[in-house]
């Protein structure tokens, strides 16, 4: 397992500060930390150190280092603070995308341990979370919304009191995607059709899916029809129906009827067979 | 507010072996490095040995003067770290006190004094 | 293993002097360094890490500086509370040794 020094788990600096990181192992070791200015890498067998004589709040974030042939894959980690009073946020991304239920973090890191007691998450233009959101705080890494609903999809801000007053950081865009379980489902109404000739006949060719990103379409045995799409949403769910009206039915209207559906999971189609008489 | 307090301190023989724990509180126990220092009117302050967090692997480093004697070991569970001391020597007497690292000893215990002497 | 050394052992001052204690490295500790108070039958407190940063809740009248293997801990305007025992540690890798101590006895 390699080993860190300093050997402290936390290191508090202020700006312009000179700063070392070394990293001993058995084998080669390699660093991984936050994308920031002014690092210098030296490697030299089983050590590396990573240097800066001009420390910026961008270099606050967690430090780790690996040993990339150690079979137990072992690491160690330091967190560097760099304490700037202008600056109590270092936010390492602008965009977080997850899934609905999985936890979401927003990678704002604190510049300075202190000001751990007096932070929050807000919306942007100060505007309150909306209900229900469960977020916990943690300095190294940021806040995490947890089990994160799509309808949370908004612009965030990590605030921090610096002498009675609040500080904001850059904001960050979390975008929840909808879990899609597969392509959206269908119906297609009537299951069957028998009409007299000169009668008129509806069909309903309808789709659904929690996502709004999809596609539907009526075929008549190969011809894609062109029909006016109606949406809807209820339930939680996006609705996507195509109603074909026909006032007076022909022989030529006669045949297979299709019903598909595509999204990103795949497609589906359910078919039903109209019948034209004479009498 | 951050509470360490140690315990098993006493007198015991040269060669003899004694366990010495310490409860914290106050903190999130699991993500603390710990550490035990001892203080003797002879040596001063000196470190005694430290282990790391579970993220760390509970990596365990220890002073030359105790290395292949003494065990550190930590409950995380019961947020207690603990001391174990075998082959004492009249040289292991002093105060131990049990200790936080985060920038550096940010938190002391009272200290729980160990004697050794026949 | 980095061996420390602290000056003086003892200092003898009035109230409202300022002093410098001084602590060397036997080798670079990269600012590596953290200073402890001691008051008398009482656990060690945590003064200065990282060489010049004060701990929460230290007053402004102490100071940490230097670099390389020379550091040092500046009281300005000496209280009556400041009296007790100073130590240097440094954290550069174990083990981690402290310095022998600096005793700061009231004039």
């Known amino acids: 397992i390699p080993v860190i020094e300093p050997s402290v788990p936390e290191l508090v600096v202020k700006p312009g500060a000179t700063v070392t990181l070394r990293c001993v192992g058995n084998g080669s070791v390699e660093w991984d930390g936050p994308p920031s200015p002014h690092w210098t890498l030296y490697s030299d067998g089983s050590s590396s150190i990573l240097s800066t004589n001009n420390a910026t709040f961008q270099n606050t974030g967690t430090y780790r280092c690996t040993e990339p042939g150690d079979p137990l894959g072992g690491s160690a980690a330091i967190h560097l603070y760099v304490k700037d009073p202008a600056r109590p946020w270092n936010v390492l991304a602008q965009e977080v995308v997850v899934f609905e239920d999985q936890d979401a973090l927003l990678p704002c890191l604190l510049t300075d341990p202190v000001l751990e007691a007096g932070v929050s998450l807000v919306r942007v233009r100060g505007r309150p979370l909306m209900r229900h959101t469960n977020y916990s705080f943690s300095p190294w890494h940021g806040f995490t919304i947890h089990r994160a609903k799509f309808i949370q999809s908004q612009d965030y801000q990590c605030s921090a009191l610096m002498g009675g007053r609040k500080v904001m950081s850059i904001s960050i865009r979390l975008k929840v995607q909808k879990v899609i379980p597969g392509p959206p489902a269908l119906t297609l109404v009537p299951a069957e059709l028998v009409r007299i000739r000169g009668e008129a006949a509806q069909i309903v060719c309808s789709a659904s899916s929690v996502d709004v990103n999809f596609d539907v379409f009526l075929q008549h045995n190969n011809t894609k029809l062109a029909i006016p799409q109606q949406s809807d949403f209820h339930n939680n769910r996006y609705q996507k129906v195509l109603t074909l009206n026909l006032d007076q039915v022909d022989f030529q209207h006669a045949g297979n009827y299709s019903c598909v559906a595509s999204n990103v999971q795949g497609k589906h189609s359910t078919s039903m067979f109209f019948r034209v008489v004479e009498s | 507010e951050v509470k360490l307090e140690e315990s098993g301190g006493g007198l015991v023989q040269p060669g003899g072996s004694m366990k010495l724990s310490c409860a914290a509180s106050?903190?999130?126990?699991?993500?603390?490095?710990m550490d035990w220092v001892r203080q003797s009117p002879e040596m001063g302050l000196e470190w005694v040995a430290e282990?790391?967090?579970?993220?760390?692997?509970?990596?365990?480093f220890y002073a030359e003067s105790v290395k292949g004697r003494f065990t550190i070991s930590r409950d995380d569970s019961k947020s207690s770290v603990y001391l174990q001391m075998n082959s004492l020597r009249p040289e292991d007497t002093g105060i131990y006190y049990c200790?936080?690292?985060?920038?550096?000893?940010?938190?002391w215990g009272q200290g729980t004094t160990l004697t050794v002497s026949s | 293993d980095i061996q420390m050394t602290q000056s003086p052992a003892s200092l003898s001052v009035s109230v409202g002097e300022t002093v410098t204690i001084t602590c060397r490295a036997s080798?670079?500790?990269?600012?590596?360094l953290a200073w402890y108070q001691q008051k008398q039958g009482k656990s060690p407190q945590l003064l200065v890490h990282a060489a010049t940063n004060l701990a929460d809740g230290v007053p402004s009248r102490f100071s940490g500086s230097g670099s390389g293997t020379q550091y040092s801990l500046k009281i300005n305007s000496l209280q009556s509370e400041d009296f007790g025992s100073y130590y240097c540690?440094?954290?550069?890798?174990?083990?981690?040794?402290f310095g022998g101590g600096t005793k700061l006895e009231i004039k």
């Open positions: 106050g903190f999130t126990f699991s993500d603390a490095w």
């Open positions: 282990i790391r967090s579970k993220a760390n692997n509970h990596a365990t």
């Open positions: 200790t936080r690292v985060k920038v550096g000893f940010d938190n």
């Open positions: 080798e670079n500790i990269y600012s590596n």
């Open positions: 540690q440094h954290f550069w890798g174990t083990p981690r040794t």
